[in-house]
Every structure is written in structure tokens, then in C-alpha cells.
């Protein structure tokens, strides 16, 4: 987790002087509780936005927006703590809005936004906005939390972000798989414009099962420049196992920008359709 660029971040708006500060996620009001504390944020919304860095790179960011409740507690509102928690790693990043002037009621509801938390493709977050000072122990909570899901690199807008492009999102291998005679599969895919090797991972399954009955790995050496964007054809030999008929072919590239963590593409061959009525078994065995 990080902030988009480290240029001066602003939270000021007409009628409010405000500055954005880095935060340890442990506001002083936890340690030194105040008697009078503001109410919680209202209508917290988290949306996926996209923003460019000063270098021109495009990143997905969490756009955080909330409003204030129209009660007298805004007189005691000194700021807000914004926290983004990556759910599985438990990594947390916080910033603090510090109000340098007192809030006053005005003709429209106070609204705040922040769009500088960079988020990762295909990850899950909890976003919390805490009004400051935080409540006394056992006081009514004055925060709001929402879960937030970032789409993976197959999502149209995500595909062109820097982290997705770095993991090979623009490569479309257009995989085709055909079943040949003699228990073989012909796999064909389009090479990318990089001299890097690929791996084909074949996993076979019985018709209605999810436990594999055959696995095979095939290495494809790095193509020469004249082969870039050309089709690569590989014939894989299957194990002759009755009913081991559903095949998943996965192609793993090893691009320099993502090494062994590049996006993989896959294609599946289904089992052949079973005839509705089984063919009659002859009651005699021919000798020829």
C-alpha cells in the first residue's frame, strides 16, 4: 500500500483550511480521550478511480468520499483519519486530515474526498474513515467502514494500468486447442513481442470431477525477434486413461517485467458428448 506520488496533498475547500498528513493509524485521541467528540461520517462511498503519477504511469486508486452529519458535533470536529487495510496481509496505510480552522454550518452539507491511495489489481480492502477526535472508551463509534474489491487485470479499465501492463495484460495469446488422433492435443497460441520463454501446463480431469487424472508441463524456449506475434504450435501427448477427457491448458509467460508472476491464460477442452443411448454390445465376438 502506498500513496500516489508524494507531492503536497490538499484537503482545503471554501470555508475550511485543511492539510493532509501522514499518520501512524494511532491518533493521539486514542491515548488522551476527549470529553466531546464528533459524530460519525455519513454516506461513505468507495469507488475505483484511475490516476496518473507525475511520471505518467496510470494506477488504480481508491476514491474515498463522505459527508458530515448535520448536527452540532461538527463544532468539535478536528479532522479525520483515513485508513486502508489490505484484508489478507493486514497491511494498513493511514492519512490524517487536520482541520486548521473551525467548521461552521453552511447552506450545503460538508463533503470530503481523497483519491491518493494506490490499490493493487485483484485485491480486497477495508476502508475506514474515523472522525477526530476518536470517541472515549465505550463511547458511540464515530467511524464508518466499507469493504472494497479491486477488479483483476481482465477488467477493461484495469488492463491498461501500469501494474497490469507490467504483468502482461496486453498480451492476448488467442489460445486454440484441438484434439488429435492417438491421444494428442494440438495447442496453438500467439507469442508476445519479447524474447522470453513460456510454459504450457496441461491438467486433465474426468468428466464431472475436479480432481486431476493427468498433469504435464511443457517448456517453450524464448522466440527469436522474427517470431514475435507469430503462432506457436505444440503437440502434447495425453495419458491413455479412459474417462480422463477434460483438458485445461494454461500458458504461463515469463516476461521480464513480471518474471514468474505474470498473468496466465487458459483454455479448456470439454469431454466429448456421450450418446443418449449406449451402442448395443454384440452377443458374439467376431474373430477378425
Amino acid at each position: 500500500l502506498r500513496l500516489l506520488d508524494h507531492r503536497a496533498l490538499v484537503c482545503s475547500q471554501p470555508g475550511l483550511n485543511c492539510t493532509v498528513k501522514n499518520s501512524t493509524c494511532l491518533d493521539d485521541s486514542w491515548i488522551h480521550p476527549r470529553n466531546l467528540t464528533p459524530s460519525s461520517p455519513k454516506d461513505l462511498q468507495i469507488q475505483l478511480h484511475f490516476a496518473h503519477t507525475q511520471q505518467g504511469d496510470l494506477f488504480p486508486v481508491a476514491h474515498i468520499e463522505w459527508t458530515l452529519q448535520t448536527d452540532a458535533s461538527i463544532l468539535y470536529l478536528e479532522g479525520a483519519e483515513l485508513s486502508v487495510l489490505q484484508l489478507n496481509t493486514n497491511e494498513r496505510l493511514c492519512v490524517r486530515f487536520e482541520f486548521l480552522s473551525k467548521l461552521r454550518h453552511h447552506h450545503r452539507r460538508w463533503r470530503f474526498t481523497f483519491s491518493h491511495f494506490v490499490v493493487d489489481p485483484d485485491q480486497e480492502y477495508e476502508v475506514t474513515v474515523h472522525h477526530l477526535p476518536k470517541p472515549i472508551p465505550d463511547g458511540d463509534p464515530n467511524h464508518q467502514s466499507k469493504n472494497f474489491l479491486v477488479p483483476d487485470c481482465e477488467h477493461a479499465r484495469m488492463k491498461v494500468t501500469t501494474p497490469c501492463m507490467s504483468s502482461g495484460s496486453l498480451w492476448d495469446p488467442n489460445i486454440t486447442v484441438e484434439t488429435l488422433e492417438a491421444h494428442q492435443l494440438r495447442v496453438s497460441f500467439t507469442l508476445w513481442n519479447e524474447s522470453t520463454h513460456y510454459q504450457i501446463l496441461l491438467t486433465s480431469f474426468p468428466h464431472m470431477e475436479n480432481h486431476s487424472c493427468f498433469e504435464h508441463m511443457h517448456h517453450i524456449p524464448a522466440p527469436r525477434p522474427e517470431e514475435f506475434h507469430q503462432r506457436s504450435n505444440v503437440t502434447l501427448t495425453l495419458r491413455n486413461l479412459k474417462g480422463c477427457c477434460r483438458h485445461q491448458v494454461q500458458i504461463q509467460p515469463f516476461f521480464s517485467s513480471c518474471l514468474n508472476d505474470c498473468l496466465r491464460h487458459s483454455a479448456t477442452v470439454s469431454c466429448p458428448e456421450m450418446p443418449d443411448t449406449p451402442e448395443p454390445i454384440p452377443d458374439y465376438m467376431p474373430l477378425w
Epitope: Q45, L87, N88, T89, E124, S145, N147, L149
Partner: antibody, heavy 116, light 107 residues
């Protein structure tokens, strides 16, 4: 190929405990959390909670707090869900699933029958 | 906790039909909604995440739409393998909650 393989069916007496395992393969274990969802016979899906495979942190549904414990074993890429003080209405198929918010791969389910 | 209500409770349709299933949240979940398909004796399968994103490997005849409190799962042309129970699930607020499910049956 991402796979979550759960332990076999269990029959338990009321008041007993059950521990269901969920072994993952085909992806980087610590990248995604593991969630647990149950389904009583003929009923819908009920979220029980989740565990971080990275930190071990847990988040349980209120209904199960104090009765459920979720753990993981990183060395074997296995998650466990233990439910204590079993009652007859805990009879259900218990599923593990990958991730926290969008449950993209599921185990085959473990039927736990609670009967005296 | 947020209540998720699906309608209709069950529906009958024919192969090739366009089928629409709705899900309503008791309060706004913005786009924090997933759709799952479950066949008898099997685990659920994720179809749509974040209200409208198609999960990898899911046929393009499935689509999702909506935000706030009202959501729709559409199957553009029902196939024999689509007869199943469909669940919505919100993830914006803890605890995560599921709808009661809608069974799509053969007419």
C-alpha cells in the same frame, strides 16, 4: 489449477466439536484469505467468517463468535475450521472458499451431521 | 446486518430464453455485490463480482448490472447447464450476507 480439498463427512453428538480441514493447491497460499460458509439441508448460504493466510487474523460472524475457531497451517497450505458445542441445527455442509469478499474457488464441502 | 432479497423465489424457463433474476439490498451496497450459481450436491460457483464484472472462465451469456440497492443477473440465452440455483451476496458491509437463492427450473 486452483483446488480446495476438504476433509470427509463427520457425524457428531450434540455438545461435541468438529474440525474441518481445507487443503489448497495451485496458487500462492498467502496471497488470499480463506472464508468459511455453511449450508443447512435445503437452505441457503450462511457466511461464518474468514482467516488471513498471511497473518492469521480472523473475522467471525457474530452468530459464531465464541464457538468457532479458524486456523491455518502455512507449511501444508491448509485451513481449519473448528466448531464447538454442536447443536442439531449445526447440521450442514461446510464449505471453505478462497478470498474474503469475492469467493472465487470453493472446496467440495464437508457434511457435518449432529445427531444424538 | 444487510438483508438481501431475491425475486422471484423460483422461475421456469426454456432453453434459449432470456432470464432475469433480481436482488435487492435493505440498504445501499453501491457495487459490492456478487452472483453465484449452485447445482445440486455441488459447491457454489462465482459468476459475477462487483455487480458487473464477469469472473474469468464464465460464459459471456451471463451479465450483471445495478448499483445501490437493486441488482440484476441476466442470462441472455439459457442453456441446459444453466438450470441451477442462483445466489446474490453483498460484500460492502460486514457481515457478508447472501440472498435466499432463486431456483431456475426447466419449463
Amino acid at each position: 489449477q486452483v483446488q480446495l480439498v476438504q476433509s470427509g463427512a463427520e457425524v457428531k453428538k450434540p455438545g461435541a466439536s468438529v474440525k474441518v480441514s481445507c487443503k489448497a493447491s495451485g496458487y500462492a497460499w498467502t496471497r488470499y484469505g480463506i472464508s468459511w460458509v455453511r449450508q443447512a439441508p435445503g437452505q441457503g448460504l450462511e457466511w461464518m467468517g474468514w482467516i488471513s493466510t498471511y497473518s492469521g487474523n480472523t473475522n467471525y460472524a457474530k452468530k459464531f463468535k465464541g464457538r468457532v475457531t479458524m486456523t491455518t497451517d502455512t507449511s501444508t497450505s491448509t485451513a481449519y475450521m473448528e466448531l464447538r458445542s454442536l447443536r442439531s441445527d449445526d447440521t450442514a455442509v461446510y464449505y471453505c472458499a478462497r478470498r474474503v469478499l469475492r469467493l472465487d474457488y470453493w472446496g467440495q464441502g464437508t457434511l457435518v451431521t449432529v445427531s444424538s | 446486518d444487510i438483508q438481501m432479497t431475491q425475486s422471484p423465489s423460483s422461475l421456469s424457463a426454456s432453453v434459449g430464453d432470456r432470464v432475469t433474476i433480481t436482488c435487492r439490498a435493505s440498504q445501499s451496497v453501491h457495487t459490492g455485490l456478487n452472483w453465484y450459481q449452485q447445482k445440486p450436491g455441488k459447491a457454489p460457483k462465482l459468476l459475477i463480482y462487483g455487480a458487473s464484472n464477469l469472473q474469468s472462465g464464465v460464459p459471456s451469456r451471463f451479465s450483471g448490472s445495478g448499483s445501490g440497492t437493486d441488482f440484476t443477473l441476466t442470462i441472455s440465452s439459457l442453456q441446459p447447464e444453466d438450470f441451477a440455483t442462483y445466489y446474490c451476496q453483498q460484500f460492502e458491509h460486514n457481515p457478508l450476507t447472501f440472498g435466499q437463492g432463486i431456483k431456475v427450473e426447466i419449463k
